[in-house]
């Protein structure tokens, strides 16, 4: 008798004991995790995390689709609405450089950089070539008027408009509308002025920065949170805490992301901080990211969401603050009247579309995301869309611009830039992250629920037995 | 309130330069140009030319070329014109006069009159 | 060059009539006319901007109409503090020029 209580009372104490040491494996496993999470996510020589953010390993494309105009003479003329023909994608190949300048600051734990910019044309993924033709706004004509609504100054620039043959619109081919060509109007400027136009220059051989971040050796919680931005924490764009310089720089974020959480990120292409909520569990190449994407909240009029107050700067072309949709960032584009909204207009109000036909927003084509892994922070996957337009008023001192009767946001392009972990990377990152996480987990699992059943189970077994002894 | 106040009369001999100014207060003079307009006596108005101060940009009447130099000194909000081989034709009063954003000669000064005499 | 050409010259009114002085130009300036009236040792002022706008502060008895190239100032209603020189400007195109102008007196 004794041999089989002893044998049952054996059996249930290695089952607590599993159950336990399945239980213990919980929190100090976690704490192990974190631990790892910690070291490697920490942006110095030596770490996964500062490998990758050098250089990014994942192949970063940037798609363009060109807002063709078919109708320039009857816009010009009538002041109709425009119609506008996407065409696209043209696809580049973008921030393959690796960062520059980089300055490790022990003093505060930060990391300074620069982020060079290139773009190499990928024609197996393009519909055409940058050669192929497009009718669009003139930018040097609408920026001018803009720029200079002084009345001496107009009627000077319309001799000169006139004079270079220049009109409202232009053709342009793919290249010079991008990356930049001599126009022909500015070169008449008998006063020092860039002949130079182009919507990205210039861009090649050009850098985006300096950046500052933390590095996260003294706090995690703050890895990759932009501290200051050439120099400064404030943009000296906007008004308020709109000018701040928010979070880090999308790429990646602080480790132990939670649903709950409103991922803050810093974007110079829209020269502002923005935010991004959680939408849903999304399986990426067998690693659980969360996806979160910029709502609409964040580009509504201040009626709608009061927090975009500071984002309205001016209260004519708005409509004293009541559109949405589209954001201003002249100052940041030397007083050119550059306008960004998401591609199609997505989420703007109807009176800055209702001078453009040929648009069709939806969210699946047109809206941000950032795929997130949570327990690194790291952005796997990302899809970046946005639109850049350009405002052309009336003004009767400009012979091409006279007859127009309204102003008009005018889309230019819009883009997509993606990125996607690679096949090799992802193998990677579930071995190492996924991986040991999940077999962590499933190793408590086993331990708890192998020692509670077995501890469970030879308890009865030695309560029966004991019971029928008694008998 | 936006004031130009301009220089006092001149006499001059023929033959010499006069350099007349127009100091502005109560706007930001980069931002508008500064026009200058001659009206001998009991005749019409004649624009001579304009300058924009935010980028020295200047447009002269083709008949003043070579007569009137336009120039601003953007730190004492002033313009400044200089009138050279003065003749009796030249006697004038000279006005600078300051566009509004959207508007021609909204302000004007008080006038200076040049008068060219041996 | 547009040429703008002012008429009449000069004109003596009674107080209460109604003035009229056409600016005629010799190229299509659009709406770019500008109508200034210049009191004895006074620089001139602007009454009329381009568009036929009135100014903020000028009586309503001011008025002007036209387009293309040719042009009319009206006041409605003489008062005797209208005696003045009244010059029109064409903005559209430079080198800017004046009319003639038009000495108004009162009979």
């Known amino acids: 008798g004794c041999d089989r209580n002893c044998g049952l009372i054996t059996g249930a104490v290695i089952g607590a004991v599993l159950a336990v040491f399945g239980g213990i494996l919980m929190p100090v496993g976690d704490m192990l995790i974190q631990k790892t999470i910690k070291k490697e996510v920490v942006l110095e020589e030596g770490t996964i995390a500062f490998k990758n953010w050098v250089k990014t390993g994942t192949e970063i494309y940037r798609q363009f689709w060109i807002f063709d105009v078919q109708n320039p003479q009857e816009v010009m003329m009538n002041s109709s609405n425009i119609q506008v023909k996407q065409r696209g994608p043209y696809t580049y190949r973008v921030r393959f450089l690796a960062k520059e300048n980089i300055t490790q600051d022990p003093k505060d734990n930060t990391v300074s950089f620069l982020q060079p910019n290139g773009a190499i044309f990928e024609p197996s993924l393009s519909v055409g070539t940058e050669a192929d033709n497009f009718t669009v706004l003139n930018l040097a004509v609408a920026a001018a008027s803009h720029i200079y609504p002084n009345p001496f100054v107009q009627v000077v620039l319309n001799s000169l408009i006139n004079k270079s043959k220049s009109s409202m619109f232009q053709v342009r081919t793919l290249r010079e509308l991008l990356w930049g060509y001599t126009d022909p109007f500015l070169s008449l400027v008998p006063y020092p002025v860039s002949t130079r136009v182009g919507m990205f220059y210039p861009y090649n051989n050009t850098a985006d920065g300096v950046y500052k971040v933390f590095n996260g050796k003294d706090s995690i919680s703050k890895v990759a949170i932009i501290d200051t931005y050439k120099g400064k924490r404030n943009l000296s764009y906007w008004e308020s805490y709109c000018d701040m310089i928010n979070g880090t720089d999308a790429a990646s974020f602080p480790p132990f992301v939670e649903k709950s959480q409103v991922l803050q990120f810093f974007s110079s292409d829209i020269c502002r901080s923005i935010y991004a909520v959680f939408e849903s569990d999304v399986n990426l190449k067998g690693i659980p990211v969360y996806r979160f994407v910029l709502p609409s909240k964040a580009f509504a009029s201040p009626v709608q969401n009061p927090d975009n107050h500071c984002f309205c700067t001016e209260k004519i072309i708005s409509k004293n603050c009541t559109s949405y949709g589209v954001l201003d960032i002249s100052k940041c584009k030397e007083g050119k009247p550059v306008y960004i909204s998401l591609p199609h207009f997505l989420y703007a109000s109807p009176d800055v579309s209702e001078t453009i036909d040929g648009l069709n927003p939806n969210e699946e084509e047109h809206r941000t995301y950032l795929d997130i892994e949570p327990i690194t922070g790291f952005t796997l996957q990302f899809a970046k869309r946005l639109q850049v337009n350009l405002l052309v008023k009336p003004s009767n001192k400009i012979q091409v611009l006279k007859r127009l009767k309204r102003n008009y946001i005018v889309p230019i392009l819009w883009l997509n830039e993606t990125g996607t972990i690679g096949d090799e990377k992802a193998k990677m990152f579930r071995s190492q992250v996924t991986g040991k996480i999940n077999l962590l987990g499933l190793i408590e699992m086993i331990l708890l629920s192998v020692g509670v059943v077995m501890f469970v189970a030879f308890m009865i077994s030695y309560c029966a037995c004991r019971s029928k002894t008694i008998k | 309130e936006v004031q130009l106040q301009q220089s006092g009369p001149e006499l001059v001999k023929p033959g010499a330069s006069v350099k007349i100014s127009c100091e502005t207060s109560?706007?930001?003079?980069?931002?508008?140009?500064m026009h200058w307009v001659k009206q001998s006596h009991g005749k019409s108005l004649e624009w001579i030319g304009g300058i924009y101060p935010n980028n020295g940009a200047t447009k002269y009447n083709q008949k003043f070329k070579g007569k009137a130099t336009l120039t601003v000194d953007k730190s004492s909000s002033t313009a400044y014109m200089e009138l050279r081989s003065l003749t009796s034709e030249d006697s004038a009063v000279y006005y600078c006069?300051?566009?509004?954003?959207?508007?021609?000669?909204?302000?004007w000064g008080q006038g200076t009159l040049v008068t060219v005499s041996a | 060059e547009t040429t703008v050409t002012q008429s009449p010259a000069s004109l003596s009114m009674a107080i209460g009539e109604k003035v009229t002085i056409r600016c005629i130009t010799s190229t299509d300036i659009d709406d770019d006319m500008n109508w200034y009236q210049q009191k004895p040792g006074e620089p001139p002022k602007l009454l009329i901007s381009?568009?036929?706008t009135l100014r903020p502060g000028v009586p309503s008895r001011f008025s002007s109409s036209g387009y293309g190239t040719d042009f009319v100032f009206t006041i409605e209603n003489l008062l005797s503090e209208d005696v003045a020189d009244y010059y029109c400007l064409q903005s559209d195109n430079l080198p800017l020029t004046f009319g003639g102008g038009t000495k108004l007196e009162i009979k």
């Open positions: 381009e568009g036929n």
């Open positions: 006069a300051r566009d509004r954003y959207d508007v021609w000669f909204a302000y």
């Open positions: 109560g706007h930001t003079f980069t931002e508008y140009t």
